[in-house]
């Protein structure tokens, strides 16, 4: 039976040409997180794999940065990077959740700086 | 197009090493992490490591840990596996391969070195 | 480690039959698999990779299925070009492992 809860930073905001990080927490469950692929609508970022460290698409490498921890950080953000995200994990013996992240990427200075992983 | 050339022949003594070369060729070197896999004839393939030619970060197979060590030259776009304290168990064809767009499998295999091991 | 256990090791057909090899693994691997063609003297090929997406430049009558620990490879109406050594590997933990291979030859 899966028990766990992904908790994501769920809508968030940056300015365009800033750096965001997208960060996702599994919880109430003691699976052991085997791999998680980060994914921006179908396509796919980056995966970190626990026991072989991180894959990231080559397509994003140049702006895309593995962490904090499980986390993904993006770099020079377009108004094009404006979209859904989604954290997908796989466990042992739990099974595979998801998470979903709704970043806007914003012309100007009107970003707001709540968002809770969100670098300053 | 893609190209990963690898020398064909490699002949050397036991108890030496030895450094095998992959010449990375018709794409970016850096945003593309680079395989190695060992072929014995009857003994299948073996995977041994992976780098990331952008960081140098590398993950390795635990059972070729102290036999292999994987660096890259960024400005030449080559890979290199050094193999130490060489054996006959160590004579094999040896790839180089280019992980692949969507994951940790290889897309594109240079033709492989073959090592002899031998007095 | 993942064990891959590949069946048949060895399969002989005709030109225009059609033929399935098929991979089972020690543990669940999602979709995480990947399918290489070696012929005699050369390296491997990519055919397929997470388990039913067909490689760049791979024929369609190569197909791919499977998830979890069932996977196979099917192939229709073989071609000359066909004939070789084919391997399952997964891409999902540490090592990487390959199955050991099925020897398709020419009936």
């Known amino acids: 039976m899966m028990t766990g809860t992904i908790e994501t930073t769920g809508n968030i905001s940056a300015e365009k040409g800033g750096s965001i990080i997208l960060q996702c927490h599994l919880s109430s469950t003691t699976a052991q997180v085997t791999q998680v692929n980060w994914e921006q609508q179908d396509q796919l970022l980056a995966i970190c794999n626990a026991d072989l460290g991180w894959h990231i698409s080559p397509s994003f490498k140049d702006r895309v940065a593995p962490g904090p921890g499980l986390g993904l950080t993006l770099q020079s953000l377009t108004v094009n990077d404006t979209g859904e995200y989604f954290c997908i994990y796989h466990t042992y013996p739990d099974g595979t959740y998801t998470g979903r992240i709704f970043l806007e990427v914003l012309e100007s200075s009107v970003a707001e700086h709540g968002a809770r992983f969100q670098i300053p | 197009q893609v190209q990963l050339q690898q020398p064909g022949t490699e002949l050397v003594k036991p108890g030496a090493s030895v450094k095998l070369s992959c010449r990375a060729s018709?794409?970016?070197?850096?945003?593309?992490?680079m395989h190695w896999v060992k072929q014995r004839p009857g003994r299948g393939l073996e995977w041994i490591g992976r780098?990331?030619?952008?960081?140098?970060?590398?993950k390795y197979n635990e059972k070729f840990k102290s036999k292999a060590t994987l660096t890259v030259d960024k400005l030449s776009s080559t890979a290199y596996m050094q193999l130490s304290s060489l054996t006959s168990e160590d004579s094999a064809v040896y790839y180089c391969a280019r992980e692949g767009h969507y994951g940790f499998y290889s897309d594109y295999w240079g033709q492989g070195t073959t090592l002899t091991v031998s007095s | 480690d993942i064990q891959m256990t590949q069946s048949p090791a060895s399969l002989s057909a005709s030109v225009g039959e059609t033929v399935t090899i098929t991979c089972r693994v020690s543990e669940n691997i999602y979709s995480y698999l990947a399918w290489y063609q070696q012929k005699q003297g050369k390296s491997p090929q990519l055919l397929v990779y997470n388990a039913k997406t067909l490689a760049e430049g791979v024929p369609s009558r190569f197909s791919g299925s499977g998830s979890g620990t069932q996977f196979s490879l099917k192939i229709n109406s073989l071609q000359p070009e066909d004939f070789g050594n084919y391997y399952c590997?997964?891409?999902?933990?540490?090592?990487?492992?390959f199955g050991a291979g099925t020897k398709l030859d020419l009936k």
């Open positions: 590997q997964h891409h999902y933990g540490n090592p990487l492992t």
């Open positions: 018709g794409y970016t070197f850096t945003n593309y992490y």
């Open positions: 780098i990331d030619p952008d960081s140098g970060g590398s």
